[in-house]
Amino acid sequence: AFAPVPRITWEHGEVGLVKFHEPGIFNYSSLLMSEDKDTLYVGAREAVFAVNALDISEKQHEVYWKVSEDKKSKCAEKGKSKQTECLNYIRVLQPLSSTSLYVCGTNAFQPTCDHLNLTSFKFLGKSEDGKGRCPFDPAHSYTSVMVGGELYSGTSYNFLGSEPIISRNSSHSPLRTEYAIPWLNEPSFVFADVIHKSPDGTEAEDDKVYFFFTEVSVEYEFVFKLMIPRVARVCKGDQGGLRTLQKKWTSFLKARLICSRPDSGLVFNILQDVFVLRAPGLKEPVFYAVFTPQLNNVGLSAVCAYTLSTVEAVFSRGKYMQSATVEQSHTKWVRYNGPVPTPRPGACIDSEARAANYTSSLNLPDKTLQFVKDHPLMDDSVTPIDNRPKLIKKDVNYTQIVVDRTQALDGTFYDVMFLSTDRGALHKAVILAKEVHVVEETQLFQDFEPVLSLLLSSKKGRKFVYAGSNSGVVQAPLAFCGKHSSCEDCVLARDPYCAWSPAIKACVTLHQAEGSSRGWIQDMSGDTSSCLDKSKESFHQHFFKHGGTAELKCFQKSNLARVVWKFQNGELKAVSPKYGFVGRKHLLIFNLSDGDSGVYQCLSEERVRNKTVSQLLAKHILEVKMVARIPPSPTSQTAQTEGSRITSKMPVASTQGSSPPTPALWATSPRAATLPPKSSSTGTSCEPKMVINTVPQLHSEKTVYLKSSDNR
C-alpha cells in the first residue's frame, strides 16, 4: 500500500527554520559538515561559504571563485550560455585535511580543482585540471568521496559529456574505468562512499568504495532507453593491471539494484539519492536509496534499503553476465556459465589473495584481468531488505534522503527518514514494525523549488537537517515537538524524538531536554491512554439573531484526522441545507432559529492501529436571540454585519495559560468571511483560549475555562 499523507503539514512560516542566502549567489548544491568545528561548508555557484552549523544565518567565511571574462567568451564560442553555463559551479567539496578542503568547479566548461585553506579561507591557487573529477557541464551528474587523501569520483570526462568515468585521483596510483559501453553506459551518477573493512581503520587497504548511479541498460533491449539503477564497487587497494587494465580498475564490478513491488507491477528504476546509515546499534551499514519510476507521470517515489552484506554477496559470490554472441545483438547480455578464473575477477586483494601470493592487483594473471574487463556486470541483482520498498509515496518526487537512527523512550531504535522533494518540502517518515508513518511535511523553501542537497548533522544533542536549493540553505531541527500543545497530540504524532512531559505540560524533544525523562509519555503505536491530565479547555460563546448565519471555527492540524461536529451530542452532517462546512473544518449554520441554540463541539477523530482516538478541539455555545437594537456604549467596539450574518473573528495572537486576551476588533470583507491566520500549534487544546460574545452592533469578550470534569 502507498504510504499515507504526512500527518501534519508545516507551512514555511509556521515553524522555526534558519536560512542562509548570499545575495546574487545561486545553486547551493554542495554541503559539507565539520562536526568538530560546528561548521557547515556550502559550495554554490562561484562561491564557497563557511557558516555556523548551529545557526547557519551566521556566516563565518566566504571565498569567491569567479570565471574570467576571457574564459566566459571562449566557453560561449563553443555554443554554451554565457549567463548560466559559462560560470563556475562548485561540484566537489571534500575534506583534504583538518586545515584544507579539496574544491572543484565546472569553471566555464574547463573543470578546475584547488585547495581551500580553512585558516585563511583562501584558495592556494593550485589550478589542477579537474577533468574526470568534476563535470564540464553544470547540468551533468557527478559524485565524489575523499578516501585517505585521494578523490574517488564519478562524472563525465569530456566537454560533450559523452564520456563517463569513475576515477581515483592519486599521485602514486591513479585509476579509471575503461571508456566502454559495457562498463558505463550513459550513467547518471548519484552517490559514492567508502565502506571501511574495520572501524578502527587497521585494514584500510581492504576498504571498498561504492558508486550508485542509473544507466541505460545493456542487458535488456527495449523500444525505449530502459534505465537501470546500479551499484558499482571498486577496491581501495586496487593498483590496476600490469599490462591488461593498466591504470584501469581491476576491481570494477557493477550490479542491478532491485526496488519494486511485484504484486502491483511497480518498478522503480531511476535512482535519485542514497544514504549510508551507520549506527552503533547496527551490525552492518545499510544503504537507503530513493527511487522514482522511469515513466513518472503520476509522481511516485519509493525508498528501498539494502544491507552491505547483500550487496557484497552479489560481488563476491554472484554470477557474471557476458555479451551475447555476435549475431544475436538483440539478446544483448546473458548469464555467463563458463569457468571463472582464479583469483576471482573483480575481487579485492585481501588476506586470502595475499596468502596465495597475489600481493597486488599488478600480480594478477592476465586471464583474471581479461575476464573482468569483458565481464564488468553481475548477473545477480541486489535485493532490498524484506524484498520490498520501505515506503512508496504517491504525488511526490523525492530528491534526497538522509536517515537517522534514534532511540525512543522505551529503548526501541527507529530509523527515521528525512526525504526532500522537488517542491522544496521535507518529509519525515519513521519505520515502524509493520508500517511507515509519515510524521510530518515541512515546507523548507517558500518558492517550492527543488531541494538539491540534504545533509544530516548527527552530533549528539544537536541534530539538524540542512537542505540546499538554488536560492539558499535551510536549517531545520529534526523535530518540532513544542508545536504539539496537548499530550494526545504529542503522542499521536508518533514522533520518536518527541514525548509529553506532564510535569511541565509540554511536548519536549528527547535527548535534548534537560533533566530526567521520568514520567514522560510517548507511544509509537499512538496509544493516548496514558494522557491523563486533560489540559484546560475553553469555550466560545456566541449570540446570534434569528435568520442569520453562524460560522463556528475549528482548527485541526492532523491530515489523518477527520473533523466531527456534534450538536447536543448528535453528529452533524452537511447533507441538510441547514449546515455547511468551510475547508472541511469550520461549521456554517444557516437560517438560525431557537432550535439551533445549544452546545456545538468540534472533535477530531483519528484512526491509529484500528482504534479511533477522539479529541475535543473546540466547544461553542450558541444562543439565538431576538435582540433589540442597543445603541453602542462608548467603551464597546463595533462588529460589522454582513446582511443578517455576523462573523466573529479571533485575534491573531492566541492567548496561552490563564490570562485573558486583549480585546481586538476585526473588520470583515464584504464578499466573504476571511478565515483567521493558521494556528501555529496543532490546535488540539482548543486554541484560542477565549470566549467571544457576539451581539449585533455589540462586541465584547471574556474568557471562560472549563476543567475536564465540566460538561463536554
Epitope: D129, K131, G132, Y157, N158, F159, L160, S162, E163, S167, N169, P174, L175, R176, E178, Y179, A180, I181, P182, N185, E186, V216, S217, V218, K225, K247, S323, A324, T325, V326, S329, K332, K373
Partner: antibody, heavy 118, light 111 residues
Framework: QVQLVQSGAEVKKPGSSVKVSCKAS????????MHWVRQAPGQGLEWMGQ????????SYNQKFKGKATITVDKSTSTAYMELSSLRSEDTAVYYC???????????WGQGTTVTVSS | DIVMTQSPDSLAVSLGERATINCKAS??????????MNWYQQKPGQPPKLLIY???NLESGVPDRFSGSGSGTDFTLTISSLQAEDVAVYYC?????????FGQGTKLEIK
C-alpha cells in the same frame, strides 16, 4: 572477423541530402561506440562525431552540428550518417570507425565517397 | 580545440634506415599518467590503419619496427628500419579531449 562495410559512392546536387551506411559484423555491435571521420580530397582527417549504439545518443564536433546526423539501427547492426544541405565543400570520403577500449579507432570502414556537384 | 602539428610534412628515407615523425599538441594530451595519442598509417585509396595507441602501445599485427614514444605535448613515431610497404601518409591523433583531432599528416617516401 571484425568488419565495417560502408555503402557505395554517391553523387549529389547542392542543397540535397545523403545518408551513408556502415554495417558492422564479427562483434557485438552494441558494445562499442561508432565514430565518423571525413577526409576531403588531398586533405587530412577530421573527426565528425560519435554514437552510442545502445542508446542512440550522439555527440558531434561543433563544426558539424546541424550538418551531420548520426543514427543507428540495432536490429541490423548498422550505423548511419546523414549529411544535409550539401555544398561543394562537403565533397569528401566519409569513414566510420569503431572506437575501442584504449580510446583509439581500431577498425575502419572502407570509406564512402560523396561528391557534391551541380 | 587541441591542435596537432606534425613535422616534417614529408620525409624521404632510404630502405632499411630509421624514419622519425614528430607530433606536437597545442596542450597536454595526458591524463593521470596516460598519454592519449595514437598513430595511423594510410595508403592511397585505403582507410587509415591503427599502428600505435596510447603513445607507445603497438597494435596487434603491426610489425615491431614501429614504435611510439613521448608524453604531454611531444610525441614521436619511429620506424626502425624502413621497408617498401611503409610508404604511406602517417597521422597522429589525440583522444584526450573532444573534438578528437588529427595532425595534418606526414608523407613518407623512399629516398
Amino acid at each position: 572477423q571484425v568488419q565495417l562495410v560502408q555503402s557505395g559512392a554517391e553523387v549529389k546536387k547542392p542543397g540535397s541530402s545523403v545518408k551513408v551506411s556502415c554495417k558492422a559484423s564479427g562483434y557485438s555491435f552494441s558494445d562499442y561506440y561508432m565514430h565518423w571521420v571525413r577526409q576531403a580530397p588531398g586533405q587530412g582527417l577530421e573527426w565528425m562525431g560519435q554514437i552510442n549504439p545502445t542508446t542512440g545518443g550522439a555527440s558531434y564536433n561543433q563544426k558539424f552540428k546541424g550538418k551531420a546526423t548520426i543514427t543507428v539501427d540495432k536490429s541490423t547492426s548498422t550505423a548511419y550518417m546523414e549529411l544535409s544541405s550539401l555544398r561543394s565543400e562537403d565533397t569528401a570520403v566519409y569513414y566510420c570507425a569503431r572506437y575501442y577500449y584504449g580510446r583509439h579507432f581500431d577498425v575502419w570502414g572502407q570509406g564512402t565517397t560523396v561528391t557534391v556537384s551541380s | 580545440d587541441i591542435v596537432m602539428t606534425q613535422s616534417p610534412d614529408s620525409l624521404a628515407v632510404s630502405l632499411g634506415e630509421r624514419a622519425t615523425i614528430n607530433c606536437k599538441a597545442s596542450q597536454s594530451v595526458d591524463y593521470d599518467g596516460d598519454s592519449y595519442m595514437n598513430w595511423y598509417q594510410q595508403k592511397p585509396g585505403q582507410p587509415p590503419k591503427l599502428l600505435i595507441y596510447a603513445a607507445s602501445n603497438l597494435e596487434s599485427g603491426v610489425p615491431d619496427r614501429f614504435s611510439g614514444s613521448g608524453s604531454g605535448t611531444d610525441f614521436t613515431l619511429t620506424i626502425s628500419s624502413l621497408q617498401a610497404e611503409d610508404v604511406a601518409v602517417y597521422y597522429c591523433q589525440q583522444s584526450n579531449e573532444d573534438p578528437y583531432t588529427f595532425g595534418q599528416g606526414t608523407k613518407l617516401e623512399i629516398k
